[in-house]
């Protein structure tokens, strides 16, 4: 059986949209599928790689690579989006391309970044882990680490940094899919809101879905012990 809830939820573009949340109900009146997975049910994506889920993650990364920071012109906030989800009238889409990006390395002004910008994350202002020396962040935002410490200045002078962030990665459904959403939308979809991250590529949703012991490699499911747990 399915339980359908519909609600008007604020989406990334800044417009309210009627959204459906479909919950698979337990036929025997018991825990939901997500709870059963957390309790150690035999769920193959937690035991070994699932091709469908792998393709979903790759597709999400491809989209994220092309994203930019959508900054509302009225200073009400910013959110990482695709160009199509950033209003041409009410917002500014900050996306590095051609010569608009910062240099890859402070000491070499030649090669410029083309992947980015990312709301509230920039290799020029992150102090931990710093983008320098042998640890320069790649020109692919899906390979950026989580910045745990920003430079101590209140204002950076960068549009995508000096804005109030409105969306973060949200892990939705048992398939471990991720979307950058408002907290409101994430809660409605019964997702897990990652307050610490700026990009979906920085979180491992399947690890969150599976629970129990974290995967040794967050990209590779290894909970074969589920075969004995259930």
């Amino acid at each position: 059986a399915q339980h359908v809830t519909t609600q008007l939820v604020l989406r990334n573009k800044g417009v309210y949209e009627s959204v459906k949340y479909i919950q698979q109900e337990n036929f025997w009146i018991g825990p939901s599928s997500i709870d059963l997975i957390h309790l150690g049910a035999k769920f193959s994506p937690c035991i070994r790689k699932d091709q469908q889920i792998e393709q979903l993650v790759l597709r999400e990364r491809d989209l994220e690579r092309d994203s930019g920071c959508c900054v509302q012109n009225d200073h009400s906030g910013c959110i990482q989006t695709q160009r199509k989800d950033c209003s041409e009238t009410l917002a500014t889409f900050v996306k590095w391309q051609d010569d608009t990006g910062p240099p890859m390395d402070k000491s070499d002004l030649g090669q410029k970044r083309t992947s980015g910008a990312v709301c509230h994350q920039d290799p020029r202002t992150c102090e931990e882990p710093a983008s320098s020396g042998a640890h320069i962040w790649p020109d692919d935002i899906t390979k950026w680490p989580i910045c745990t410490e920003q430079a101590k200045s209140n204002r950076t002078g960068f549009l995508h940094m000096d804005c109030q962030i409105k969306g973060r990665p949200c892990c939705i459904s048992t398939k471990g899919s991720c979307e950058i959403t408002t907290r409101e939308y994430c809660e409605f979809m019964h997702g897990y809101f990652h307050e610490e991250a700026t990009l979906c590529s920085q979180v491992h949703c399947l690890d969150k879905v599976c629970g129990l012991l974290p995967f040794l490699n967050p990209e590779v499911p290894d909970q074969f012990y589920r075969l004995w747990l259930s």
């Epitope: 008007l8 573009k13 800044g14 417009v15 309210y16 949209e17 009627s18 009225d74 160009r83 199509k84 209003s87 041409e88 009238t89 009410l90």
Partner: antibody, heavy 116, light 107 residues
Framework: QVQLQQSGAELVKPGASVKISCKAS????????MNWVKQRPGKGLEWIGQ????????KYNGKFKNKATLTADKSSSTAYMQFSSLTSEDSAVYFC?????????WGLGTLVTVSA | DVQITQSPSYLAVSPGETITINCRAS??????LAWYQEKPGKTNKLLIY???TSQSGVPSRFSGSGSGTDFTLTISSLEPEDFAMYYC?????????FGGGTKLEIK
């Protein structure tokens, strides 16, 4: 400058379908939402839906979901709207308009007359 | 869907006067209301969005105000070219909806 050139007036029979076009120029067609708006005399404006030519994503007004089909051809920078099972209620001027939340650029409209 | 009630539907005034057109939403739409001008043989023109933000190139005599459910378009010192049809549109939620229009004519 941005221009939206709409196809000419159509006279169609009840029950038939009609496909009208909107050719865009002066901007990157793939990067902006295209909307369709209906105007009947004395009835004001009604938003039908919008399409993002870059990936074909669409949003529809529920009222027109089974009536209108929005498509876009990136190679010719043209947006299309097909209206099916036409009745006299569908006689109207149909506008294409660029924008996501508000409509900055409009076409001049296409008059569709449904008559036996 | 959000219903938008626009008033008056018809207005006849003289050039140089100041007029106001009102739009009322059936529910709270925050500040997200736009105003358009329609003239025969010309493409529709966006005047104001987000309640009070003027679209670039729009003369300063056009101004918008309001939030929540009540909004106003004010045109001060009417010029001959301002006599036209005006519509409001909410852009707070899907589906976008329009007011019924106000016809502004020369007295």
């Amino acid at each position: 400058q941005v221009q939206l050139q709409q196809s000419g007036a159509e006279l169609v029979k009840p029950g038939a379908s009609v496909k009208i076009s909107c050719k865009a120029s002066g901007y990157t067609f793939s990067n902006y939402w295209m909307n369709w708006v209906k105007q009947r005399p004395g009835k004001g404006l009604e938003w039908i839906g919008q399409i993002y030519p870059g990936d074909g994503d669409t949003k529809y007004n529920g009222k027109f979901k089974n009536k209108a089909t929005l498509t876009a051809d990136k190679s010719s920078s043209t947006a299309y709207m097909q209206f099916s099972s036409l009745t006299s209620e569908d006689s109207a001027v149909y506008f294409c308009a660029r924008g996501d939340l508000v409509f900055v650029y409009w076409g001049l409209g296409t008059l569709v007359t449904v008559s036996a | 869907d959000v219903q938008i009630t626009q008033s008056p539907s018809y207005l006849a005034v003289s050039p140089g006067e100041t007029i106001t057109i009102n739009c009322r939403a059936s529910k709270n739409i925050r500040k997200y209301l736009a105003w358009y001008q329609e003239k025969p043989g010309k493409t529709n023109k966006l005047l104001i969005y987000s309640g009070s933000t003027s679209q670039s190139g729009v003369p300063s005599r056009f101004s918008g105000s309001g939030s929540g459910t009540d909004f106003t378009l004010t045109i001060s010192s009417l010029e001959p070219e301002d006599f036209a049809m005006y519509y409001c549109q909410q852009h707070n939620e899907y589906p976008y909806t329009f007011g019924g229009g106000t016809k502004l004519e020369i007295k």
